[in-house]
């Protein structure tokens, strides 16, 4: 039975050229996290964090994606094309799979606010 919940940074905005932290947090379960996958809006895989074998970043994003903090992901040198949905998928044992959603809006404006509040999707 899946008792856990995924909390995410929800809907966030950040400045073009800046950076942003995508963060998911699994709570209310004792399940062991075996792997976390981070996917982009077109469902392409950005990064994997395997519990035994560490972080793996998609080659095209190596210069712009940094692992962490924790199981999160930092996107750097943001472009307007980075606007869209991001998904964290937590593979756990024995619970199974949990999935969280974050919407990132990249703004041209210099007054872009980077909100980092946690919310349950």
């Amino acid at each position: 039975m899946m008792t856990g919940t995924i909390e995410t940074t929800g809907n966030i905005s950040a400045k073009k050229g800046g950076s942003v932290i995508l963060q998911c947090h699994l709570s209310s379960t004792m399940a062991q996290v075996t792997q976390v996958n981070w996917e982009q809006h077109d469902h392409s895989l950005l990064a994997i964090r395997n519990a035994e074998l560490g972080w793996h970043i998609y080659p095209a994003f190596k210069d712009r994606v940094a692992p962490g903090p924790g199981l999160g992901l930092t996107l750097q040198s943001l472009t307007m094309n980075d606007t869209g949905e991001y998904f964290c998928t937590y593979h756990t044992y024995p619970d199974g799979t949990y999935r969280g959603r974050i919407f990132l809006e990249v703004l041209e404006s210099s007054v872009a606010e980077h909100s980092a509040r946690f919310q349950i999707p």
Partner: antibody, heavy 117, light 106 residues
Framework: EVQLVQSGAEVKKPGASVKVSCKAS????????IYWLRQAPGQRLEIIGR????????YFVDKFKNRATLTTDTSASTAYMELSSLRSEDTAVYFC??????????WGQGTLVTVSS | DIQLTQSPSFLSASVGDRVTITCKGS??????LVWYQQKPGKAPKLLIY???NLQSGIPSRFSGSGSGTEYTLTISSLQPEDFATYYC????????FGQGTKVEIK
């Protein structure tokens, strides 16, 4: 052309150690992690661990954590895998492979390690 | 981790035959599936990545498809150099391989 060339076959006695080398060429050695895998007779390929040549950081599958040692010599673009306390079940073909993101794009030719008394 | 089961384990075929190999996951693989070819005493060779993307330099007679838990590798017209063992590999949850399918000459 990317190439990974491994050292030759080894025969070892139970309890001994073996060290296998993997010489990389055709790309910048520090830009890709090297994985070590093995295939025992009649068994599927299994991962032993990973080393990042850029910083020497290693990762191991739990099964091999206490017996495997991974190192690199970046000046020679060579990775090494040492397995200690050998037993007959360690008889296998050992492979090094380069990982490109999430999958292995180039492999060594394999090194047969036979453990026999 | 996801367990992968290939079928068949052995396959006898003739040059020119259309050959299909199946790889089934114990859980959803999410299209994060790769196919390798290996000949005796040689390094495995990457054929297809992300379910259906042909690796550079691989002949177009090789193709991949699938979704969810079921994936297939198809060789449209088997050539003499295609007699080998084929492995699937997934990275959606863990990094695991199928047991292999040996394609032999009939």
């Amino acid at each position: 052309e990317v190439q990974l060339v491994q050292s030759g076959a080894e025969v070892k006695k139970p309890g001994a150690s073996v060290k296998v080398s993997c010489k990389a060429s055709g790309y910048t050695f520090t830009e890709h992690s090297i994985y070590w895998l093995r295939q025992a007779p009649g068994q599927r390929l299994e991962i032993i661990g990973r080393i990042d040549p850029k910083n020497g950081r290693t990762y191991f599958v739990d099964k091999f954590k206490n017996r495997a040692t991974l190192t690199t010599d970046t000046s020679a673009s060579t990775a090494y895998m040492e397995l200690s306390s050998l037993r007959s079940e360690d008889t296998a073909v050992y492979f090094c492979a380069r990982i490109d993101g999430f999958y292995f794009d180039f492999w060594g030719q394999g090194t047969l390690v036979t453990v026999s008394s | 981790d996801i367990q992968l089961t290939q079928s068949p384990s052995f396959l006898s075929a003739s040059v020119g035959d259309r050959v299909t190999i199946t790889c089934k996951g114990s859980q959803n693989v999410n299209k994060y599936l790769v196919w390798y070819q290996q000949k005796p005493g040689k390094a495995p060779k990457l054929l297809i990545y992300s379910t259906d993307n042909l690796q550079s330099g691989i002949p177009s007679r090789f193709s991949g498809s699938g979704s969810g838990t079921e994936y297939t590798l198809t060789i449209s017209s088997l050539q003499p150099e295609d007699f080998a063992t084929y492995y699937c590999y997934q990275y959606n949850n863990g990094f695991t391989f199928g047991q292999g399918t040996k394609v032999e000459i009939k």
